[in-house]
Interface confidence: low
C-alpha cells in the first residue's frame, strides 16, 4: 500500500490530525521536500544577520551579514566582524598587525613576513602591515650580467577568499 503522505508536495505537510490530508505549511514554516509529516520553522535573520532570501513555503530563509561583518560557517551560521587590511580581529576588536606580520584581507590573522633568507634570497620590497615582503634574487644573482629582476605580480583583490 502506498503511503498517502507521499502525495503531499513541498510546501505542505501530511496532517495526521486530519486524516493525513496535505495541509499547507503554517506561516513562518516550510517543507522543502514532499511527503513531510511536519514543516520546519523558518530561520530568522536578526541582529547582525540580514535576510538575503525570504522564507517561502518550500524553502528556508537565507541570511548574510550586515556591512562590516562577513559570514562564517555552513549557511552563514555566524557573522564575524571585518577588520581593515593590516589588522586582525581579537577579543577587543580590530588590532594592527605587530611589526613583522601582515594581513592583506579583511578577515583572518596576521601572518609573519616571508623569511627571504631561508630561500637564499634577499628582500626586494620591504613588508608592511598590509603586504608581505617581496623576495628578490640572492645577492650573487645580481652580479653584472645576471638577468634582470622580474617585477612582482600585482597583489590579488583582498577579502574574496571562498567561504
Amino acid at each position: 500500500l502506498q503511503d498517502p503522505c507521499s502525495n503531499c508536495p513541498a510546501g505542505t505537510f501530511c496532517d495526521n490530525n486530519r486524516n493525513q490530508i496535505c495541509s499547507p505549511c503554517p506561516p513562518n514554516s516550510f517543507s522543502s521536500a514532499g511527503g513531510q509529516r511536519t514543516c520546519d520553522i523558518c530561520r530568522q535573520c536578526k541582529g547582525v544577520f540580514r535576510t538575503r532570501k525570504e522564507c517561502s513555503s518550500t524553502s528556508n530563509a537565507e541570511c548574510d551579514c550586515t556591512p562590516g561583518f562577513h559570514c562564517l560557517g555552513a549557511g552563514c551560521s555566524m557573522c564575524e566582524q571585518d577588520c581593515k587590511q593590516g589588522q586582525e580581529l581579537t577579543k577587543k576588536g580590530c588590532k594592527d598587525c605587530c611589526f613583522g606580520t601582515f594581513n592583506d584581507q579583511k578577515r583572518g590573522i596576521c601572518r609573519p613576513w616571508t623569511n627571504c633568507s631561508l630561500d637564499g634570497k634577499s628582500v626586494l620590497v620591504n613588508g608592511t602591515k598590509e603586504r608581505d615582503v617581496v623576495c628578490g634574487p640572492s645577492p650573487a644573482d645580481l652580479s653584472p650580467g645576471a638577468s634582470s629582476v622580474t617585477p612582482p605580480a600585482p597583489a590579488r583583490e583582498p577579502g574574496h577568499s571562498p567561504q
Epitope: Q81, T90, K91, C110
Partner: nanobody, 122 residues
Framework: EVQLVESGGGLVKPGGSLRLSCAAS????????MSWFRQAPGKGLEWVSH????????DYADSVKDRFTISRDNARNSLYLQMNSLRAEDTAVYYC???????????????WGQGTLVTVSS
C-alpha cells in the same frame, strides 16, 4: 534554540542613567564570553564591552570606559549594562551577543539579540 533578548532601552536626558538587560536561554550561559555592541543611526556596529563566563575578565571600548559597567548573573542567565553619564552620542540600538572563541585572532559573535533602542536627548 539559543535566544538572547535585550530590554531596558528608552529615552533618557543627557547625564542620565539606564540599565540594559539581556536574558539568555538555550545554552550554557556561564561557559561563554558575552559582549555588548551598539549601532548608532546610519553608522556601523561598535563593540562596547565584554565579560568572561565567570565575570573575572572585563573590558570596555575607550568611548564608554568609566561610564558603563558590564556585569552578569549566571544563576539568572542574564547579562547587564549599566550606563551612567549618558551623552547624545550614546544614542544607538544596543545588542548583546554571544562570543564563540575558536582560534587566535578569530572571534565569532554567533548569536545576537534583536536589540534595544537607547535615545539620549534633552
Amino acid at each position: 534554540e539559543v535566544q538572547l533578548v535585550e530590554s531596558g532601552g528608552g529615552l533618557v536626558k543627557p547625564g542620565g542613567s539606564l540599565r540594559l538587560s539581556c536574558a539568555a536561554s538555550g545554552f550554557a550561559f556561564s561557559d561563554y564570553y558575552m559582549s555588548w555592541f551598539r549601532q548608532a543611526p546610519g553608522k556601523g556596529l561598535e563593540w562596547v564591552s565584554h565579560i568572561s563566563g565567570s565575570g573575572t575578565t572585563i573590558d570596555y571600548a575607550d568611548s564608554v570606559k568609566d561610564r558603563f559597567t558590564i556585569s552578569r548573573d549566571n544563576a539568572r542567565n542574564s547579562l547587564y549594562l549599566q550606563m551612567n553619564s549618558l551623552r547624545a552620542e550614546d544614542t544607538a540600538v544596543y545588542y548583546c551577543a554571544r562570543e564563540d572563541i575558536r582560534m587566535p585572532g578569530t572571534t565569532d559573535f554567533d548569536h545576537w539579540g534583536q536589540g534595544t533602542l537607547v535615545t539620549v536627548s534633552s
